[in-house]
Interface confidence: medium
């Protein structure tokens, strides 16, 4: 194994303005009794989590994609966005076996895979929130302004999706540029960010930009759009449309529950590193532990959307049953009477809501 050259890595890097200590020798009162701490979780437990999420996500998102692609007739705009959402989750899930293996054996896959799987993880998050922001805009235009523009111009939706993937790649670019396999002296190699001599400055710039454009901005768009959408639905007593919106609201709610805690902690970490929040040893350790505790929710998210569709999305269940019946896996008699080959919800005109 190649040995790690300390001079090449983060020279003059000012990681912090505090110091940590391990077990101190007796009677050394002037040494800070603090050391880096993160959650102590058994690596095999982590591997089990990865394996479960991988299997659930692979099965669930494959089915979602199958049902949407199978239902060509009456496929809504939201369906197209959810297809892309499932695609992003599936791509991320495919990297989980690699992360699981790395947890046990260290990063044995080299720099190329290090860059690729890290990129997929970032792209999954950014495309996810940007697609949900687009769904919120689409629902806002359809319900609040009764606009049919997007629905009538499907090429525009394809352009929007392409733009989302491009922007997600752009936001995830720092990972592609700076991640590499780092060979350490006494432990297994790691897939890590090496930004050269200006790590702290780079990390701040490359964290603030994605957090602003890839999290805070889409979040504000979603809050604005769904705020007005809900107000319109309740004011107009549009019960049918409200029911049709249940799945979308559930998808957004689960996304926020899974990703908001992590990104709020990350924001606190960013504020502390930029000295906008006073940095203390206790605070640093609390943030480290919170990052570990909240990141698992983000990982779990990739397998949750199909479960939402299965439990809340009536049309998804119908669509799935239709496919099973088409292939003779179940009797056609067991199909609901109103089952159609898509999972478009009931709503007026071209403003259909998915699942």
């Amino acid at each position: 194994m190649q040995s790690f050259n300390f001079e090449d890595f983060w020279e003059n890097e000012d990681f912090s303005n505090y110091s940590y200590s391990s077990d101190l020798p007796p009677s050394l009162p002037d040494v800070a009794p603090c050391r880096p701490e993160s959650l102590e979780i058994n690596k095999y437990f982590v591997v089990i989590i990865y394996a479960l999420v991988f299997l659930l996500s692979l099965l669930g998102n494959s089915l979602v994609m199958l049902v949407i692609l199978h239902s060509r007739v009456g496929r809504s705009i939201t369906d197209v966005y959810l297809l892309n959402l499932a695609m992003a989750d599936l791509l991320f899930a495919l990297t989980l076996p690699i992360w699981a293996a790395a947890k046990v054996n260290g990063w044995i896959f080299g720099t190329f895979l290090c860059k690729v799987v890290s990129l997929l993880k970032e792209v999954n998050f950014y495309s996810g929130i940007l697609l949900l922001a687009c769904i919120s805009v689409d629902r806002y235009l359809a319900i609040v302004h009764a606009t049919r523009t997007l629905t009538q111009k499907r090429y525009l939706v394809k352009f929007v999706c392409l733009s989302i993937w491009s922007l997600s790649l752009l936001l995830a670019l720092p990972v592609l540029l700076f991640r590499r396999t780092v060979y350490l002296t006494y432990i297994s190699p790691v897939c890590y960010e090496d930004m050269g001599n200006n790590t702290a400055k780079w990390r701040m710039v490359l964290r603030i930009l994605p957090q602003t454009f890839g999290f805070i901005l889409p979040l504000l768009i979603m809050l604005f759009c769904y705020g007005f959408t809900l107000r319109t639905l309740f004011k107009a007593h549009m019960g049918q449309k409200h029911r049709a919106m249940r799945v979308i609201f559930a998808v957004v709610l689960i996304f926020l529950l899974c990703w908001l805690p992590y990104h709020l902690v990350l924001l606190a970490d960013t504020l502390m590193r930029t000295r906008l929040i006073n940095e203390t040893c206790q605070r640093r350790n609390n943030i480290d532990q919170a990052l570990d505790a909240t990141e698992i929710l983000g990982i779990l998210h990739s397998c949750l959307n199909p479960l939402i569709y299965a439990f809340i999305g009536q049309k998804f269940r119908h669509g799935l049953l239709k496919i099973l019946a088409t292939h003779g896996l179940i009797s056609k008699d067991s199909l609901p009477k109103d089952s159609r080959p898509s999972f478009v919800g009931s709503s007026s005109g071209h403003t259909s809501t998915t699942l």
């Epitope: 020279e11 912090s16 110091s19 940590y20 993160s38 959650l39 432990i187 790691v190 990141e295």
Partner: nanobody, 126 residues
Framework: EVQLVESGGGLVQPGGSLRLSCVAS????????MGWYRQTPGKQRELVAD???????NYIDAVKGRFTISRDNTKNTVYLQMNSLKPEDTAVYYC????????????????????WGQGTQVTVSS
């Protein structure tokens, strides 16, 4: 968990020599400064010498010309070569290092910590 292990201490006659070694192990990304401190009973510890990753060296006046600090970055090790030892050099010698370590369950992050060894006894006596 990061550990610093010292070795090389012992009993030596005045004018003799000893070589102390300190090896750092664990989830180490990088070691910034490594140094040697000493402490005698009832007194505060004092810095003997330290060396940065860039090779900048600092000694206290009492040991200049007699002690030499060096480090091997590839082995995460710091050495203290002690020549012309005097009875007043008798103390417990502690290794100290400012280390960038990896923390994190899902995503690994770098954090700086200040770590200490358990100490090695150096006795200069005839």
């Amino acid at each position: 968990e990061v550990q610093l292990v010292e070795s090389g201490g012992g009993l030596v006659q005045p004018g003799g020599s000893l070589r102390l070694s300190c090896v750092a192990s664990g989830s180490i990304v990088r070691i910034n400064t490594m140094g040697w401190y000493r402490q005698t009973p009832g007194k505060q510890r004092e810095l003997v010498a330290d060396i940065t990753s860039g090779g900048n060296i600092n000694y206290i006046d009492a040991v200049k010309g007699r002690f030499t600090i060096s480090r091997d970055n590839t082995k995460n090790t710091v050495y203290l070569q002690m020549n012309s030892l005097k009875p007043e050099d008798t103390a417990v010698y502690y290794c100290n290092a400012e280390i960038v370590v990896l923390v994190g369950v899902w995503t690994q992050r770098a954090r700086t910590g200040n770590y200490w060894g358990q100490g090695t006894q150096v006795t200069v006596s005839s």
